[in-house]
Interface confidence: low
């Protein structure tokens, strides 16, 4: 028969023939002949290989280097990578997660619309009328403004997005 | 103010084992902000970081190639302190000892851990 | 691994001179480096962290700068006490070869 010029799913075409791939968490040791199969071997230990692959070397797992202000999130396995994060109040650069930085505070006026995680920065939004932030924060909204009516007094001095209004009592009618 | 008080001989046969502790007063070797190192200075002057150990939920050490095969740090929580092991060494160990403690400073950059805090260095030469 | 290399392995000053010391990295280390002084005979200490900014109790007149692969340690007088050797070290821990910085 004609040699195969390709080949099924999970293998591959070497010297004319169609070898298997190793599965994930296992490396190509050597390659399949006429007689023989492809032969694989589980990754070592703090290795890993995340597909049906021939590969002759594992990945090694990733470090999440303590210096970055890295732990780990998720241990890797043979098939899959370390997953890591930051430590508490720090949120990754980037979406490989390679070093940290602090989270972000709200400046007043402006109050905390999405906490901040490990992954993502903390979102700020600007305090809408009605709401006020007078702190710089990673934590709090915007706080609305204190209702005078509702304690049966007048508004002596309009809030601002900084500022809280500011109650007095109503002026008594005069004779 | 942190200090680490280095104790250990200061002469040991090839083939031995060198082994030395690091005493910590004024923190703790279970934070969760520091690392404890070993650090060597060769007669030529070199440093060398060794390894470390640190807490971070559960205990991981770190250890530089050329010593991992013989090398093992260990916290020891009950005394507050940490211990250098060196298997089989040999004259080229022979050196200067250092324990320290590393932390993040803070910084505008990424977290990065600096040696604040030395030992007072324990000479160790290698000989029969 | 990244290798780093001072230069000049000596330079020899008067007190009240200005010192340049140079730390090159063989790879960007971004702004992951810190400057240690070293006397005869006592362990290394702190000078500098993260390429610029000084340790605890240490005097204005040192100075760091760089990033990348490019840093400068800077005395701006020397004072009979800064004759030292002065390291600078990366953030996977290694250190350079030092610079003796002595008396002329």
């Known amino acids: 028969p004609e040699p195969p010029t390709a080949c099924r799913e999970k293998q591959y075409l070497i010297n004319s023939q169609c070898c298997s791939l190793c599965q994930p968490g296992q490396k190509l040791v050597s390659d399949c002949t006429e007689f023989t199969e492809t032969e694989c071997l589980p990754c070592g230990e703090s290795e890993f290989l995340d597909t049906w692959n021939r590969e002759t070397h594992c990945h090694q797992h990733k470090y999440c280097d303590p210096n970055l202000g890295l732990r780990v999130q998720q241990k890797g396995t043979s098939e899959t990578d370390t997953i890591c994060t930051c430590e508490e109040g720090w949120h990754c650069t980037s979406e490989a997660c390679e070093s940290c930085v602090l989270h972000r505070s709200c400046s007043p006026g402006f109050g905390v619309k999405q906490i901040a995680t490990g992954v993502s920065d903390t979102i700020c939004e600007p305090c809408p009328v009605g709401f006020f932030s007078n702190v710089s924060s990673a934590f709090e909204k915007c706080h609305p403004w204190t209702s005078c009516e509702t304690k049966d007094l007048v508004v002596q001095q309009a809030g601002t997005n900084k500022t809280d209004v500011v109650c007095g009592p109503q002026d008594r009618l005069r004779a | 103010q942190v200090q680490l008080q280095q104790s250990g001989p200061g002469l040991v046969k090839p083939s031995q084992t060198l082994s030395l502790t690091c005493a910590i007063s004024g923190d703790s070797v279970s934070s969760n902000s520091a690392t404890w190192n070993w650090i060597r200075q060769s007669p030529s002057r070199d440093l060398e970081w060794l390894g470390r150990t640190y807490y971070r939920s559960k205990w991981y050490r770190d250890y530089v190639g050329s010593v991992k095969s013989r090398i093992i740090i260990n916290p020891d929580t009950s005394n507050n302190q940490f211990s250098l092991q060196l298997n089989s060494v040999t004259p080229e160990d022979t050196a200067i000892y250092y324990c320290?403690?590393?932390?993040?400073?803070?910084?505008?950059?990424?977290?990065?851990?600096?040696?604040?805090?030395w030992g007072q260095g324990t000479t160790v030469t290698v000989s029969s | 691994e990244i290798v780093l290399t001072q230069s000049p392995a000596t330079l020899s000053l008067s007190p009240g001179e200005r010192a340049t010391l140079s730390c090159r990295a063989s790879q960007s280390v971004s702004s992951y480096l810190a400057w240690y002084q070293q006397k005869p005979g006592q362990a290394p200490r702190l000078l500098i962290y993260?390429?610029?900014n000084r340790a605890t109790g240490i005097p204005a007149r040192f100075s760091g700068s760089g990033s990348g692969t490019d840093f400068t340690l800077t005395i701006s007088s020397l004072e009979p006490e800064d004759f030292a050797v002065y390291y600078c070290q990366q953030r996977s821990n290694t250190f350079g070869p030092g610079t003796k910085v002595d008396i002329k």
């Open positions: 993260d390429a610029s």
């Open positions: 320290t403690r590393a932390q993040w400073l803070g910084g505008d950059y990424p977290y990065y851990y600096s040696m604040d805090v």
